[in-house]
């Protein structure tokens, strides 16, 4: 794979991957009551990270804020920040890596600095699918947690703090803001990777040129102002072609501003 | 407004079978549920079930399963309840209702009576 | 199924008087997720479809005289006319509205002096 589509796919997945991981921090649907040997009721209830809500068979949904910071267990407040810093980084990421992108040119940056920047937008891209993923899978075990603890008959209040009635304990399983969660991480990591991936197909290496020799011979030494271009052509009018680039280039690259290493 | 119009009296034989209908007007049909209830001469209310007009979706009770058959036709705004195997202890108005807020039931039809009588 | 139990079975009072009824679930009607009561009170004159008076054990359908007003809590609830009228003769039902099959208590039915 040439590293302009590694880059590129690896650009195209982290923001399918950072797109989730909004989607899911939004989402109302991190846990759902299980209704797998429950009594029936005509109630579902469901909680994401911001509110909790209720549906009612008639159809009307009820949705209520969690107007409270100190009052949270301090676990959702970890999931919460978790997932915000998989957000920050992930904007970030991708601010980077629009102007790290192979395929748009900016200025006279050169193409040691956009390995840089793709370099760091896939360090941030990883970061930031770890962050959601370690998120989303706090706050699965602390459900799985609470679901081994609730029992039928406990006295419970709101999700099981506070209230002095004995109800039926609602319990709670994963929802499906976990799986986005958990599939959105997912991909942003491996968006990260990938940039990573590229990153290191654009850098070159100078050990890749010790072992080229090039043969000025009058039918491949071209004049050019600005200085002599060697061709490792026999006979024939091709660029050379950068050894780090791994295949054929587009004709954007050719037309691309020339760098140190165009020059023998 | 909200109206729901049930079907007339029926006067049935023990073993047969009746239909009964009701219509809703003034709101999306299909976007409710709507109940049956039970109620036999001068006694309580019995939920008998519910269906979805919007994709067919039933509960009932799992005392009529069986007895009860819920239906809804989505462009004639109208729910039906077939009864079967009809027997004296079938006799009872029979209600429609739309279930409303807090899954209680807002708006009743006025009630269909069926007598079972050979 | 649930048992919805309600007392007593029939009240006779003269116009103007307070009346309360009471009603029992056998199991907790109150959902921890909006800490609401799925308890509805109905009221059926004869030769009419029962009228729905107050849902969530407290909120009074609209329309409906504020004299009516429903209290209660988890398991007990209880229904309230404050001052009754002459229009007030009916048979009152309480429905538990939370757990599949719905269940209906046998009534209070109120009469009037």
């Known amino acids: 794979m040439s590293v302009t589509a590694c880059q590129g796919l690896g650009f195209v997945v982290s923001l399918i991957g950072f797109a989730g991981i909004i989607a899911a921090t939004c989402m109302d649907q991190w846990s759902t009551q299980d209704l797998y040997n429950n009594p029936v009721t005509a109630v579902f209830n469901y909680q994401g990270l911001w509110r909790s809500c209720v549906r009612e068979s008639s159809g009307f949904t009820e949705c209520r804020g969690y107007f409270t910071l100190l009052g949270l267990p301090a676990m959702l407040q970890a999931v919460r920040a978790l997932m915000i810093v998989g957000i920050v980084l992930g904007v970030i990421g991708i601010l980077v890596s629009i102007f790290a992108l192979k395929c748009i040119r900016i200025g006279s940056m050169d193409d040691s600095a956009k390995a840089k920047m793709t370099l760091t937008s896939g360090i941030l891209f990883i970061i930031s699918g770890i962050s959601a993923i370690i998120g989303v899978s706090v706050f699965a075990n602390m459900l799985v947690t609470n679901f081994w603890m609730s029992t039928a008959n406990m006295y419970s209040g709101m999700g099981g703090m506070g209230g002095m009635v004995q109800t039926v304990q609602t319990r709670y399983t994963f929802g499906a803001a976990l799986f986005v969660g958990w599939v959105a991480g997912g991909l942003t990591l491996i968006g990260g990777v990938m940039m990573c991936i590229a990153c290191r197909g654009l850098t070159p290496d100078d050990s890749n040129f010790k072992a080229v020799s090039y043969h000025a011979s009058g039918q491949n030494v071209a004049y050019r102002p600005g200085g002599f271009k060697a061709s490792t052509g026999f006979g024939s009018n091709t660029r050379n072609k950068k050894i780090y680039d791994g295949g054929a280039r587009t004709e954007d690259d050719e037309q691309s501003h020339p760098t140190k290493y165009d020059y023998v | 407004q909200v109206q729901m119009k049930e079907s007339g009296a029926e006067l049935v034989k023990p073993g047969a079978s009746v239909k009964i209908s009701c219509k809703a007007s003034g709101y999306a049909f299909s976007t409710y549920w709507m109940d049956w209830v039970k109620q036999r001469p001068g006694k309580g209310l019995e939920w008998i079930g519910q269906?979805?007009?919007?994709?067919?979706?039933?509960n009932y009770n799992g005392k009529f399963k069986g007895k009860a058959t819920l239906t809804a036709d989505k462009s004639s705004s109208t729910a039906d309840m077939q009864l079967s195997s009809l027997t004296s202890e079938d006799s009872a108005v029979y209600f429609c209702?739309?279930?409303?807020?807090?899954?209680?039931?807002?708006?009743w039809g006025q009630g269909t009576l069926v007598t079972v009588s050979a | 199924d649930i048992q919805v139990t309600q007392s007593p079975s029939s009240l006779t009072v003269t116009a103007g008087e307070k009346v309360t009824m009471s009603c029992k679930s056998s199991?907790?009607?109150?959902?921890?997720?909006?800490?609401?009561?799925?308890l509805t009170w109905y009221q059926q004159k004869p030769g009419q479809p029962p009228k729905l008076l107050i849902y969530w054990a407290s909120t009074r359908e609209s329309g409906v005289p504020d004299r009516f007003t429903g209290s209660g809590f988890g398991t007990d609830f209880t229904l309230t006319i404050s001052s009754v009228q002459a229009e007030d003769l009916a048979v009152y039902y309480c429905q538990n509205a939370y757990f599949y099959p719905f269940t209906f208590g046998s009534g209070t039915k109120l009469e009037i002096k």
């Open positions: 269906i979805y007009p919007g994709n067919g979706d039933t």
């Open positions: 199991q907790s009607l109150l959902n921890s997720g909006n800490q609401k009561n799925y």
């Open positions: 209702a739309r279930l409303g807020y807090g899954n209680s039931f807002t708006y």
